[in-house]
């Protein structure tokens, strides 16, 4: 039959023959011949190689360096190579995991809008009207500002991006109460207390 | 002429092992590449495992890697399957089949043996 | 790894018929697909390889055809000894070898 120009996946051209890759977790030793098939030999301790290959060597194993604040996520096999993870609280420079960082605190004035992973860093966002965040944090969220209303307090200061709305008695002096007719001879009004300590002294 | 003969099918527990064997005759055994083939009842066809002719390199189906072991003695020819760990999933008639190559990237199957059935159950 | 589909799963035929079975490929397999013929409680047997070459000792009514993904299996007239379960096998990226899940021809 005439040589082959082309080979089957899994397969490589050499000296006008196909010859079978060798399989996932082992190298080549020799290319197939007419009567022998390709020879292949496992990966060592601590070597890899992840596709079909005709490779005279295997990959070494990625080596999670905890001077970089490395760890091992998933060890590898004679087919995979080592994934490598952040230690806790500190995030992958790139997608390689070659190296880590400190996650970002949301400084204040800012909150968490997703938590770091081990491999994405922290993202804050800008506390909108109504809400605050008066540290800085990696986990806290804005917090919403408390609601004087439902404490049946008023606000004594506005609130910012940064601070709560500070919460106060009602004013005294403002305060409204009702007269009872007694009081007032029968004609119902609404006088405040000033004018109701006037009118009990005259 | 070509004959494929299996044998060392049987009835065994979950969790048990049994080991057939597959005799050639009718060709240079160790210049092929063999199969294992199983059929579930009233399923369709399955690969099992292959090995290579000379070297004896191995592939299997990720249903069986890590629990069965093939092999092939080329001074006997003989094709073993060594079946560990069995569940219920490997009942079914195993067939040994002859590829038309002798590496581990072959097929067609040329032919095939006439099948033992392997049955898993307590 | 690549899937195998036949199509249709069965089929009523009468002798005489001429039948045809489909097999369609995950990806392009080129010409490197083969068919099987499977009688009851018997073994598989190799019909056609490399899509459309007859295997030794296979009557001429038999003939596929195809490449790439799509492959056909024709019967040119159907005989009674042709009601079986026809299988096709991709043997361009292997191991793992796959099969499609079989196409049962019943007498109508």
């Known amino acids: 039959p005439e040589p082959p120009t082309a080979c089957r996946e899994k397969q490589y051209l050499i000296n006008s023959q196909c010859c079978s890759l060798c399989q996932p977790g082992q190298k080549l030793v020799s290319d197939c011949t007419e009567f022998t098939e390709t020879e292949c030999l496992p990966c060592g301790e601590s070597e890899f190689l992840d596709t079909w290959n005709r490779e005279t060597h295997c990959h070494q194993h990625k080596y999670c360096d905890p001077n970089l604040g490395l760890r091992v996520q998933q060890k590898g096999t004679s087919e995979t190579d080592t994934i490598c993870t952040c230690e806790e609280g500190w995030h992958c420079t790139s997608e390689a995991c070659e190296s880590c960082v400190l996650h970002r605190s949301c400084s204040p004035g800012f909150g968490v809008k997703q938590i770091a992973t081990g491999v994405s860093d922290t993202i804050c966002e800008p506390c909108p009207v109504g809400f605050f965040s008066n540290v800085s944090s990696a986990f806290e969220k804005c917090h919403p500002w408390t609601s004087c209303e439902t404490k049946d307090l008023v606000v004594q200061q506005a609130g910012t991006n940064k601070t709560d709305v500070v919460c106060g008695p009602q004013d005294r002096l403002r305060e409204q109460k009702l007269i009872s007719e007694e009081d007032l001879g029968g004609e119902q009004k609404l006088i405040s207390e000033e004018d109701l300590h006037h009118h009990h002294h005259h | 002429e070509v004959q494929l003969v299996e044998s060392g099918g049987g009835l065994v527990q979950p969790g048990g092992s049994l080991r057939l064997s597959c005799a050639a005759s009718?060709?240079?055994?160790?210049?092929?590449?063999m199969n294992w083939v199983r059929q579930a009842p009233g399923k369709g066809l399955e690969w099992v495992s292959i090995i290579s002719g000379t070297i004896g390199k191995t592939y299997y189906a990720d249903s069986v890697k890590g629990r069965f072991t093939i092999s092939r003695d080329n001074s006997k020819n003989t094709l073993y399957l060594q079946m560990n760990s069995l569940r219920g999933e490997d009942t079914a008639v195993y067939y040994c089949?002859?590829?038309?190559?002798?590496?581990?990237?072959?097929?067609?199957?040329?032919?095939w043996g006439q099948g033992t059935l392997v049955t898993v159950s307590s | 790894d690549i899937q195998m589909t036949q199509s249709p799963s069965s089929l009523s035929a009468s002798v005489g018929d001429r039948v045809t079975i489909t097999c369609r490929a995950s990806?392009?397999?080129?010409?490197?697909l083969n068919w099987y013929q499977q009688k009851p409680g018997k073994a598989p047997k190799l019909l056609i390889y490399a899509a459309s070459s007859l295997q030794s000792g296979v009557p001429s009514r038999f003939s596929g055809s195809g490449s790439g993904t799509d492959f056909t299996l024709t019967i040119s007239s159907l005989q009674p000894e042709d009601f079986a379960t026809y299988y096709c096998q991709q043997s361009y990226s292997t191991p793992p070898i796959t099969f499609g899940q079989g196409t049962r021809l019943e007498i109508k």
């Open positions: 009718g060709f240079t055994f160790s210049s092929y590449a």
């Open positions: 089949a002859k590829d038309t190559e002798r590496d581990i990237t072959g097929s067609p199957f040329d032919y």
């Open positions: 990806q392009s397999i080129s010409s490197y």
